[in-house]
Interface confidence: medium
């Protein structure tokens, strides 16, 4: 039986639906009751979808596949794959059995366009001709890995002193960070191009650097000294302010928020316009307050991964910057207490008491005490495991030898929130008979 599939890979954008074409030539008198159709992953042989005994047997692949039932009788065995993910990339085999048997494999090539690159400079103030500057070009959420090119204002490729890293996120999409180190001339334009080799999609950005010939007074940028504490899932405001001079207009303002350590762009306001969030679309400025010198940043739906230092750069004619720390926190749940063994307990028995508290941040401090308020420090083992969101589950185990009876309390303290969660258990040992 001849089974036909396209020779070229099917290219599908992440999040869209893809059709993996497969066809066969039914003989006269063919009925669907005769058809056995199986789609499977070519390499692992994992079942994806099947049609047997005259019936669509449904999706075995995360409920994201479908056949074209109205077209099967005409020999169309194509498979619809919904909401394509990076992990779907690969070869799918279409097996068709009527009386005879045939199969063919079709390749799925997944792709995602890269964002317009953001450009950051380090250092970014008091630049003079002859200074070495590091220019970082960052582009996000593309697939597959990008090709990155740099060039100067005359279109000359820059290949020396370029370091490019590409990191895949949980969805398999790549964030590209390319760093160019250059020695400044009188002034210069540097451009970075991020090319998606599958989509032949180009995303590029430029930065023009005009070094100062003489030092000027810096803009005074003010941020809070203490870290901003934000609960996971809530919104946080990273305060930053500057003092605008008389006659100041937003057209003069360049405002950049970036991660202090990695120089990743978070949000920017340039050329009189809010350039939007470059940070998972979870940041916003306060546009109505900018003209009064309020350059604060709103960070929405705070995650553990947001914790760290954010730098607020303000450039008008002069330049200034300051860093504000974000401390993320999440309260711990009321501890649950378990005993092992938990029956037929007698004075003198050794018992293990486990105190468990969940989904807190940062790591907890754990304390035990007995019914008289005496701290228990010996024979305590505490483990803290972070989940995918970075939140900690705490399990603390106390081993004690029972007296006639006793109360044992465990306290789980969040050191940032100064939040205490405690649980206790009272054990009454049965007398010896």
């Amino acid at each position: 039986l001849e089974v036909q599939v396209p020779e070229d890979p099917v290219v599908a954008l992440v999040g869209t639906d893809a059709t993996l074409c497969c066809s066969f030539s039914p003989e006269p008198g063919f009925s669907l009751a005769q058809l056995n159709l199986i789609w499977q992953l070519t390499d692992t042989k994992q079942l994806v979808h099947s049609f047997a005994e005259g019936q669509d047997q449904g999706s075995a692949y995360a409920n994201r596949t479908a056949l074209f039932p109205d077209l099967l009788a005409q020999g169309n065995a194509s498979l619809r794959l919904q909401r394509v993910r990076v992990a779907d990339e690969g070869s799918f085999t279409c097996f068709v059995s009527i009386r005879d048997f045939g199969s063919a494999a079709v390749s799925l090539q997944v792709a995602a366009p890269y964002s317009k690159p953001s450009m950051t400079l380090e250092p970014n103030k008091d630049l003079r001709p002859g200074d070495t500057v590091t220019i970082t070009c960052s582009s996000y959420q593309g697939y597959p890995e990008a090709e990155v090119f740099w060039q100067d204002g005359q279109g000359v490729p820059l290949t020396g002193n370029v370091t490019t890293s590409q990191m895949a996120n949980e969805q398999g999409l790549f964030d590209v960070h390319s760093i160019l180190r250059v020695v400044l001339g009188a002034n210069g334009t540097y451009s970075c191009l991020v090319r998606n080799p599958v989509l032949q999609q180009d995303a590029h950005s430029s930065v023009t650097i005009t070094p100062q010939r003489s030092p000027t007074g810096a803009v005074e940028v003010q941020v809070p000294e203490d870290p901003v504490v934000a609960l996971v899932g809530t919104d946080a405001t990273l305060r930053c302010s500057f003092s605008p001079e008389p006659g100041f207009s937003l057209a003069q303002l360049n405002l950049i928020w970036q991660l202090t350590d990695t120089k990743q762009l978070v949000h920017s306001f340039t050329e009189g316009r809010d350039q939007g969030s470059a940070y998972a679309n979870r940041t916003a400025l306060f546009p109505d307050l900018l003209a009064q010198g309020n350059a604060s940043l709103r960070l929405q739906r705070v995650r553990v991964a947001d914790e760290g230092s954010f730098t607020c750069f303000v450039s008008i004619r002069d330049f200034g910057s300051a860093a504000v720390s974000l401390q993320v926190a999440a309260p711990y749940s009321k501890p649950s207490m378990t005993l092992e063994p938990n029956k037929d307990l007698r004075p003198g028995d050794t018992v293990t008491i486990t105190c468990s508290s969940y989904r807190g941040y940062p790591e907890a401090e754990v304390f035990w005490q007995d019914g008289q308020g005496v701290p228990l420090t010996g024979n305590v083992t505490t483990s803290q495991m972070a989940n995918e969101q970075g939140l900690f589950d705490v399990h603390s185990v106390l081993r004690v030898v029972l007296g006639a009876n006793g109360t044992y309390s465990c306290l789980v303290r969040n050191p940032v929130l100064q939040q205490d969660a405690h649980g206790s258990v009272t054990i009454t040992g049965q007398p010896m008979t």
């Epitope: 090119f149 060039q151 204002g153 000359v156 490729p157 290949t159 451009s191 191009l193 430029s206």
Partner: antibody, heavy 121, light 106 residues
């Protein structure tokens, strides 16, 4: 129609200078970088450098640095290449060539007809 | 500098022949571009970015390759294809051309 029209042939003595012009038409002159390439008789192509008409910024092949000067006059959409201290091995056809439109197109999509420069005593 | 070596330096072929020429770079390049030049004329862009056909160029011309080895193929040689073909790179400065492959009538 996009065209690059170059000035006529030149005969020069060793030690002299030559200035070749290249007039662009059919497109916006300042949107494309202009380069110069030469070809000695019976030889291959040799890149000399380029000029960004928008900024006047230049890039030169090290081999010609100090002898070549590229300029432009945006008012008449014309690029110039001047080569000084000529020697007999500079005898060649000199071409202006337009770099591809995209900032990252590293090839030449339109060429002038060429200007023959002969250096002879 | 990146040196580009074209081979063969010349070849003889008949109309209708399939013709292949290569360009070898002394170190890896991102893209290769190809030009055709006829005697007394300026070069003409044929293939850019390794495999893309320039505007107005017949589909019998194709390019391929990556890294250091690139190929220009003419699937069925026509009378107007007898010319010299040059490869060019600008992945690193300075921009360089190959020495050329001259395609002559057999």
């Amino acid at each position: 129609e996009v065209q690059l029209v170059q000035s006529g042939a030149e005969v020069k003595k060793p030690g002299a200078s030559v200035k070749v012009s290249c007039k662009a038409s059919g497109y916006t002159f300042t949107e494309y970088i202009m380069h110069w390439v030469r070809q000695a008789p019976g030889q291959g192509l040799e890149w000399m450098g380029g000029i960004n008409p928008a900024s006047g910024g230049t890039t030169y092949n090290q081999k010609f640095k100090g002898r070549v000067t590229m300029t432009r006059d945006t008012s008449i959409s014309t690029a110039y290449m001047e080569l000084s201290r000529l020697r007999s091995e500079d005898t060649a056809v000199y071409y202006c060539a337009r770099k591809g439109k995209d900032y990252f197109d590293w090839y030449f999509d339109v060429w002038g007809q060429g200007t023959t420069v002969t250096v002879s005593s | 500098d990146i040196q580009l070596t074209q081979s063969p330096s010349s070849l003889s072929a008949s109309v209708g022949d399939r013709v292949t020429m290569t360009c070898s770079a002394s170190s890896s390049v991102s893209y290769m571009h190809w030009y055709q030049q006829k005697p007394g004329k300026a070069p003409k862009l044929l293939i850019y970015d390794t495999s893309k056909l320039a505007s107005g160029v017949p589909s019998r011309f194709s390019g391929s390759g990556s890294g250091t080895d690139f190929t220009l193929t003419i699937s069925s040689l026509q009378p107007e294809d007898f010319a010299t073909y040059y490869c060019q790179q600008w992945s690193a400065s300075p921009l360089t051309f190959g020495g050329g492959t001259k395609v002559e009538i057999k």
